[in-house]
């Protein structure tokens, strides 16, 4: 067990051009406060994912009113440290999010309004018990200077706060196999208290209350020898001497995660994904409640009806997230079709359409033929951003402006001869064939295949194709 401590030194304009405007004014006095969110490991999770290691809110800072004409100075800060207690081991690597919030104190209907001024995030390695680490982070035109450390709460010591120390029983030395507790040389490292009944020969523990088995042993207290009979999905390694191991209890067996947390195995142990309102290695620490004011941007906090909903924030229009910390970007609804660019204008959504598309949601494929004429009786055919002309007989080209040779495509079948004509083409059919394209054989008895020759035309006569 221990505490992560964060000390904010300053929050103000960063170096360089483009100094930010002061967040407060004579008409709208305001004050700052900070929120820190910690997650184990070097995760790059979304800002609203659970703060599995814990979270803390600072007190509100002094009220600040901008002096007219003066650039934004470093803003007055809340007193004291932000402290995030952790119940179990300190993970050594962690991710942090530090948010600077502004509380406007004007005549707001329904109380003060909150808005997020800046959010910084990072991933760090930190041993518990070490000195304060200093950091500078920039968010836009703002700069945040802060220090942080992790310290163990007695009797825990060590870089992960997992070793326990007890006062020496004898003035001169510690018990067998136990070292003095640096830096508390007058105390001794206490033996870890494993789970009651854990086999002293075949079991060990790295944290109080657990019982981990040496190879070849299984069971909750490591008292059951591993079977060498056939097994399906060995959890341990197989060897020539032992065959394969029967799956021992996995780190998630029996779900060590409290309060509705879900367990997932990691290479070394397990990890709990905690429901909102809980944190700690096993989700056993009850976190933020409505008393902490967790809902931002005017969100209404309602105490959860059960432990896995310590609180619910009912967000005002335009905000979302577990703490109403995110402005709703309605473009995330993906309203624009056909690759249109979405713009959330606040009062309305707009889609900026790609060429060839139109409509409020870019859902209409534009009539590519609009305003484009096909010459010589051609008709325009729409086609995904480029118009095409289907030309009348005798014409060709992109806009049907070119006179075409209707016989170029050799339209007369069965050796028929083609003649260009002002209204199209004429096929003079070879003996034995008939039809506009000489496509029908003439039967020997003089009857023709369908369709019948029109009256007044003998099979073999030239036929005009109109």
């Amino acid at each position: 067990a221990g505490v992560f401590e964060l000390q904010i030194h300053s929050f103000g304009p960063g170096p360089g051009p483009g100094a930010p405007r002061s967040p407060c004014s004579a008409r709208l006095p305001c004050r700052l406060f900070f929120r820190v969110c910690l997650k184990p490991g070097l995760s790059e999770e979304a800002a609203e994912s659970p703060c599995a290691l814990g979270a803390a809110l600072s007190a509100r800072g002094p009220v600040y009113t901008e002096q007219p004409g003066a650039p934004a100075p470093d803003l007055p800060l809340p007193d004291g440290l932000l402290q995030v207690p952790f119940r179990d081991a300190w993970p050594g690597t962690f991710s942090f999010i530090i948010e600077t919030w502004r509380e406007e104190l004007g005549d707001q209907i329904g109380g003060p309004a909150w808005s997020l001024l800046a959010r910084v995030a990072g991933r760090r390695r930190l041993a518990a018990g070490g000195p304060w680490a200093r950091d500078i982070q920039r968010a836009g035109a703002w700069e945040l200077r802060f220090s942080y450390r992790a310290r163990c709460e007695p009797p825990a010591v060590g870089t992960a706060c997992t070793r326990l120390c007890r006062p020496r029983s004898a003035p001169s030395r510690c018990g067998p196999g136990l070292r003095p507790c640096a830096p508390l040389e007058d105390e001794c490292e206490a033996p870890l208290v494993c789970r009651a009944g854990c086999s002293p020969e075949h079991g060990f523990c790295e944290q109080p209350g657990e019982c981990r088995c040496l190879e070849g042993w299984t069971g909750p207290l490591c008292t059951v020898p591993v079977s060498t009979s056939s097994c399906l999905s060995p959890r341990g390694p197989s060897s020539a001497t032992t065959g394969c191991l029967v799956p021992g209890p996995g780190p998630c067996d029996g779900n060590p995660c409290a309060n509705g947390g879900s367990c997932s195995e990691t290479p070394r142990s397990f990890e709990c994904t905690c429901p909102r309102g809980f944190y700690g290695l096993r989700c056993e620490v009850s976190g933020v409640t409505c008393a902490d004011g967790p809902c931002f941007n005017g969100g209404l906090c309602v105490g959860g009806a059960d432990p896995d909903s310590a609180y619910i924030c009912h967000c005002p229009p335009g905000f979302q997230g577990s703490n109403c910390e995110k402005r709703v970007d309605r473009c995330s609804l993906q309203p624009c079709r056909n690759g249109g660019l979405c713009l959330d204008l606040g009062h309305a959504l707009r889609c900026r359409c790609r060429a060839g598309f139109a409509g409020p949601r870019c859902e209409h494929d534009l009539d590519d033929c609009a305003g484009r004429a096909c010459a010589n009786g051609g008709t325009c055919v729409e086609g995904g951003g480029a118009h095409r002309c289907s030309c009348a007989l005798g014409f060709g080209g992109r806009d049907c402006r070119e006179r075409a040779d209707p016989c170029a495509a050799r339209p007369c079948a069965h050796g028929g001869r083609c003649y260009a004509h002002f209204s199209g083409l004429v096929c003079a059919c070879a003996p034995g064939y008939m039809g506009a394209r000489c496509e029908f054989p003439v039967h020997p008895d003089g009857a023709s295949a369908l369709p019948a020759a029109p009256p007044g035309l003998r099979p073999g006569d030239p036929q005009r194709y109109l």
Epitope: A46, P317, Q320, V328, R330, S332, L333, Q334, P335, C336, R337, A348, C351, P360, R361, E363
Partner: antibody
Framework: QIQLVQSGPELKKPGETVKISCKAS????????MHWVKQAPGKGLKWMGW????????GYADDFKGRFAFSLETSASTAYLQINNLKNEDTATYFC??????????WGQGTSVTVSS | DIQMTQTTSSLSASLGDRVTISCRAS??????LHWYQQKPDGTVKLLIY???RLHSGVPSRFSGSGSGTDYSLTISNLELEDIATYFC?????????FGGGTKLEIK
Amino acid sequence: QIQLVQSGPELKKPGETVKISCKASGYTFTDYSMHWVKQAPGKGLKWMGWINTETGEPGYADDFKGRFAFSLETSASTAYLQINNLKNEDTATYFCARYDGYAMDYWGQGTSVTVSS
Amino acid sequence: DIQMTQTTSSLSASLGDRVTISCRASQDHSNHLHWYQQKPDGTVKLLIYYTSRLHSGVPSRFSGSGSGTDYSLTISNLELEDIATYFCQQGDMLPWTFGGGTKLEIK
């Protein structure tokens, strides 16, 4: 043709977890957000929220914050709804629906979830 | 949140009748009003979007109208396959909300 096919009915005990799937076909999955709607027995429709299929970012209605999680398996054109620590009041039919920029234009057939001890 | 009210929870009509189902919103929502049909087997289909636009494949006997806070769905010539529950939904402000539904039955 456009289809949303949901996984089969589920019978669960209070405290358990359920994960419902919604497999899309007939269109480009990542072009349209996917929405989830709850219908308790004999009741009306209640919008739960959505997930952006391009970024994976979810948005939840107030009554569905906490125990509910939307997720994606983009390669399989599938959206998921997971409900943790089930309660009796989670007994309902859950629908997935595609949003076309105006309305939810295509719906899954619904997945019935019964929570009973 | 915008509340959607369908005052008539059930409605009986004869085949061939002209049927109108109404829906009222607690505040104006810029015509972002949609109508859905839920058949007795549970399947849900979009009928009308953006107040009056007919979704593809929906028979032309369905039509929608309204503005501001008052909207309606009309079936001009009731057929047996129209037996269903009809829901209105506003899509202007998050969270989206549905009316309680109007169940349409045959006399």
